[in-house]
């Protein structure tokens, strides 16, 4: 059989030519009659095998981390047979390892981020070395780690490269630290190789600080014009956290006037002063509030950095603006009856400077030829007024101070003109009769209405009447049909166009007012030559009109 | 897990130099214990080992190629790379990377190969 | 260097079946180092067995691996849709390392 120990040879050695072992036959006296053959990956190239010994050597350097074992196989020959001696065997080459490699770190760069604040004994990251020795050949590829660099505020486990936070730590001081862990391989022991890394450590924000106003007092001014919703300046107060630990709100603590308010800027984080209602530096001139500032977010178990808000005063002086006159009204309505002499009182309108130096005012009257205005506001006609022309007057009369021109306010005053009874009834349109000369007595000739120009109080009522003169002539005859109308009749049969072609008329209609006037109109009749039927070709337009008469008793 | 990812110009033309990279992800190519191993495939053909290299730069090529390929390593970007010279027809073919146990030989894993095609 | 010739080299056989695939050195190799490995059109090759005998990791238990010397067998036990594809064996005991030639399962 074949007679072999284990084949060990060390790696890196520097020979060119390492004795490995023996292998060789039991049936082998010596004699030199056996030949001996290694096969495999590696026969001949790395490994060769003294033909007549069996001895094995290496005949290259080795190295364990780029392979670590060689199965090969071994034959033996009978020279003089040709045949073998023994069956075609396998053995193993290994190679035994050297502490030919320092640890180092593959997984580089390291960075871990843990909580400011954090208590000792937080792990914070772990660090891994890899040594390509072999970690089962004695204590080549044992590793220890220590911590060059990092106390007090860190530590390592010897054996883990767990790192742990050892003291703690503020963000606010310090915001990351660099750590050099050293894997020392043999277990730290004499001929140890060693290799580091550095880890970044950052800190990250806990809410441990609250906001605080760096001024204690802030000076803001606001226009008396500013309309609501406009800012009227900034405050800003200092968080020493970062991001959502740092956002916060500002509100306001004491505003007996509620005349302000603040909002946050969330993306500035300053506190925008709003105006909430208008101010008038007139009625008070300066205002002083407290605002207060607190985090948006605040965890449970940070309250303790939370107890008591930062709080800031803001003086907010009013700024006087020089403002227009006011009316005492937003409008006036007056009221004159017509026909009143020029320079009759209308009535008066007052308005006044609101600031406080009182200007005088002057006033004035926009494109009116009718009215005129002193400076005391009173409102005078510059002409007779005809209610029958305009009945009513829309005035623009404006206000400006006398020390700033341009401050100048207007408001509509409407004048209305009173009637008075001025104008007598007349006939709504021009009437033109005519009349046959058959007409037999009673017989309507023509219906007459009136108008007034005057604006009735209660409802025009007019009176009909025919002269003195045509009622003693009695040719015709009015009848008064109590509705504002009137109707003319024959008093007497037959007309004679020879001799009378044309009557003129006068009717007198009088109105229901206080004083009554009265007015003359004259009818004009015409007779006309007509048939027995009441038709003629010189009346046929009255012959239509004539047609529709109707008689009287 | 260890992953290997070819790259290269997928049309080479004759005579010139084939040069394709592997990238590997997921684990150091910096570790003792293994080789990293070019094969290629011919097209509806078997596999054929081009050759392989140590981390530290030790090389192992096929004879049958070995006058025309390099490979070479570069642990900084955690690639090896092949450079196949004077190119021919019957270079066209698929290309794979793979990781070799030294002790062993197997190969495992492999890239999902990339087919380069010689051709003017 | 070692030549590796696999047979059948076509083998067709239906789901459910048993399957045994050959490898032949043209000398000894050392079972330790000889691999065997599935390829699917259009993707690598996939490690199947490891030292002749060891299934690598994720496969299934129906593939086991045989053999010593120049003879070695991949064999799997109950064929399954997924497992038709091309085997090859490979051999790592002499320099060049070589493949055999491969064995097509086709679904009969």
């Known amino acids: 059989g074949w007679v072999w120990n284990q084949f060990f040879v060390p790696e890196e050695m520097n020979t060119t030519s390492h004795h490995v072992g023996r292998l060789r036959s039991d049936l082998d006296n010596g004699n030199n009659s056996f030949q001996y053959k290694l096969l495999g990956a590696g026969a001949g190239s790395t490994f060769i095998i003294d033909e007549r010994t069996g001895d094995i050597y290496a005949i290259e350097k080795l190295d364990r981390e780029e392979r670590s074992l060689y199965i090969l196989r071994a034959q033996v020959i009978d020279i003089t047979t040709g045949r073998a001696v023994e069956p075609e065997s396998e053995f193993v080459i290994k190679v035994s390892d050297i502490n030919d490699n320092e640890p180092k770190f593959l997984d580089e760069p390291y960075e871990a981020i843990v909580p400011e604040m954090s208590p000792e004994g937080t792990l914070v990251i772990q660090v891994t070395a890899s040594d390509a020795d072999d970690p089962s050949s004695g204590n080549n590829a044992r590793l220890l780690y220590s911590l060059l660099q990092g106390q007090p505020y860190f530590s390592v486990e010897p054996t883990t490269g767990v790192i742990r936070i050892s003291s703690k730590m503020d963000r606010e001081l310090q915001d990351e630290y660099w750590v050099i862990i050293q894997a020392k391989d043999m277990i730290g022991q004499p001929g140890a190789l060693s290799g580091t890394t550095s880890v970044l450590i950052k800190l990250s924000d806990v809410n441990d600080n609250k906001p605080i106003f760096k001024e204690s007092l802030y000076r803001l001014t606001v226009s008396e014009s500013a309309p609501t919703g406009t800012s009227i300046g900034t405050i800003m107060a200092y968080d020493n956290d970062i991001g959502e630990n740092a956002e916060m709100d500002y509100s306001i603590e004491e505003d007996d006037s509620q005349t302000f308010d603040i909002i946050t800027n969330h993306e500035t984080q300053e506190g925008i002063v709003i105006l909430k209602k208008k101010v008038n530096f007139e009625h008070q001139n300066h205002y002083g509030i407290r605002a207060k500032v607190k985090n948006h977010h605040v965890d449970e178990q940070l309250m303790k950095y939370h107890t008591e808000a930062s709080t800031t005063f803001i003086k907010i002086q009013v700024e006087d603006v020089d403002e227009p006159p006011l009316f005492l009204l937003p409008y006036y309505i007056f009221e004159i009856f017509e026909e009143t002499p020029q320079g009759s009182f209308v009535g008066v309108v007052s308005a006044t400077d609101p600031d406080n130096r009182k200007s005088p005012i002057r006033y004035s009257i926009t494109r009116s030829k009718v009215f005129n205005i002193d400076d005391n506001g009173t409102i005078t006609t510059t002409n007779s007024l005809d209610r029958e022309i305009s009945a009513w007057y829309n005035l623009s009369i404006t206000a400006t101070e006398k020390y700033n021109i341009e401050q100048i306010s207007s408001i509509p005053v409407y004048v209305q003109v009173l009637n008075i009874n001025d104008h007598a009834p007349e006939f709504s349109q021009y009437y033109e009769s005519y009349v046959c000369e058959n007409a037999g007595s009673g017989q309507v000739i023509q219906t007459i209405s009136a108008v007034d120009r005057d604006e009735s109080i209660e409802e025009h009522h007019f009176y009909f009447n025919l002269s003195v003169e045509d009622t003693n002539s009695s040719s015709f005859t009015i009848i008064d049909n109590q509705d504002n109308t009137a109707v003319i009749l024959t008093n007497r049969t037959g007309f004679n166009l020879q001799e009378e072609p044309i009557f003129y008329i006068s009717i007198l209609i009088a109105d229901n007012g206080i004083p009554s006037l009265t007015s003359t109109n004259t009818l004009t009749i015409h007779v006309c030559d007509c048939d027995d039927s009441g038709s003629t070709q010189t009346c046929q337009y009255q012959e239509l009109m004539l047609s529709m008469g109707f008689k009287t008793e | 897990q260890v992953q290997l990812q070819e790259s290269g110009p997928g049309l080479v033309k004759p005579s010139q130099t084939l040069s394709l990279t592997c990238t590997v992800s997921g684990g150091s190519i910096s570790r003792g214990g293994y080789y990293w191993s070019w094969i290629r495939q011919h097209p509806g053909k078997g596999l054929e080992w081009i050759g392989y290299i140590f981390y530290r730069g030790r090389t192992y090529y096929n004879p049958s190629l070995k006058s025309r390929v390099t490979i070479s390593v570069d642990t900084s970007k955690n690639q090896f790379s092949l450079k196949l010279s004077s190119v021919t027809a019957a270079d066209t073919a698929v290309y794979y990377c793979?990781?070799?146990?030294?002790?062993?030989?197997?190969?495992?894993?492999w890239g999902q190969g990339t087919l380069v095609t010689v051709s003017s | 260097e070692i030549v590796l010739t696999q047979f059948p080299g076509t083998l067709s056989l239906s789901p459910g079946e048993r399957a045994t695939l050959s490898c032949r050195a043209s000398q000894s190799v050392s079972s330790s180092y000889l691999a065997w490995y599935q390829q699917k059109p259009g993707q690598a090759p996939r490690l199947l067995i490891y030292?002749?005998?060891s299934r690598a990791t994720g496969i299934p238990d129906r593939f086991s691996g045989s053999g010593s010397g120049t003879d070695f067998t991949l064999t799997i036990s109950r064929l399954e849709p997924e497992d038709f594809a091309v085997y090859y064996c490979?051999?790592?005991?002499?320099?060049?390392?070589?493949f055999g030639g491969g064995t097509k399962l086709e679904i009969k």
């Open positions: 793979a990781r070799v146990n030294s002790n062993y030989g197997w190969f495992d894993p």
């Open positions: 490979q051999q790592y005991g002499s320099s060049p390392l070589t």
């Open positions: 030292g002749a005998s």
